[in-house]
Amino acid sequence: YDFTNCDFEKIKAAYLSTISKDLITYMSGTKSTEFNNTVSCSNRPHCLTEIQSLTFNPTAGCASLAKEMFAMKTKAALAIWCPGYSETQINATQAMKKRRKRKVTTNKCLEQVSQLQGLWRRFNRPLLKQQ
């Protein structure tokens, strides 16, 4: 999906008002210096691409974040404020076999959510030069 035509300001507002708090809640008890940010993004569409990938694609050691509150809110925000996103997801859902995943918070998931926090912060500061 191409995130170029999303309403970035509405997504930013959703992040600032609620998604950010859910990410902090998920990471509670973890030191902010515990993980190094290794995933970066260069502009808002790229940031949303990376955010979608890290939030919804299973990775080794972190099977699923999709049932977390921040993930539910992220998917809803993309569906509401990114034209055509819903259709791509409806088609993907119908094509995909159902797999039930247990919610397990592993260190790998914490690291992944730490990366997400960095991507969201970068999304909110699109005019900053890449380090």
């Epitope: 008002s17 609620t18 999709a66 049932k67 977390e68 509150m69 993930a71 539910m72 809110k73 998917k75 809803a76 569906a79 819903s86 997801q89 409806i90 993907a92 859902t93 119908q94």
Partner: nanobody
């Protein structure tokens, strides 16, 4: 098995109001987010509103200020209060639930705004 059943649609004049209901079974309602999509004839399905268990809500620009989403956990029911309806609100309205949002779907309820 999760089932979502929408009701409350009908024919209403421009400027009128309707309240849609979505009764959910087969899930612990308060643990999930709920939302409403709509599909107008010949158009893509559009996500118009969502409500989350912490009370936060999202609205599409096209309905903000006119529609209000709410949920009653004790009744396992979500609502969409639609005020100041316009002809362009004519669509089949579907309720959906998080985390997936895109499955399962109910059968939908038709809202027609016409004079």
């Amino acid at each position: 098995e999760v089932q979502l059943v929408e009701s409350g649609g009908g024919l209403v004049q421009p400027g009128g109001s309707l309240r849609l209901s979505c009764a959910a079974s087969g899930l612990t309602f308060s643990r999930y987010a709920m939302g409403w999509f709509r599909q107008a004839p010949g158009k893509e399905r559009e996500f118009v509103s969502a409500i989350f268990s912490d009370g936060s809500t999202y609205y599409a620009d096209s309905v903000k200020g006119r529609f209000t989403i709410s949920a009653d956990n004790s009744k396992n029911t979500a609502y969409l209060q639609m005020n100041s309806l316009k002809p362009e609100d004519t669509a089949v309205y579907y309720c959906a639930r998080g985390p997936n949002w895109f499955d399962p779907w109910g059968q939908g309820t038709l809202v027609t705004v016409s004079s």
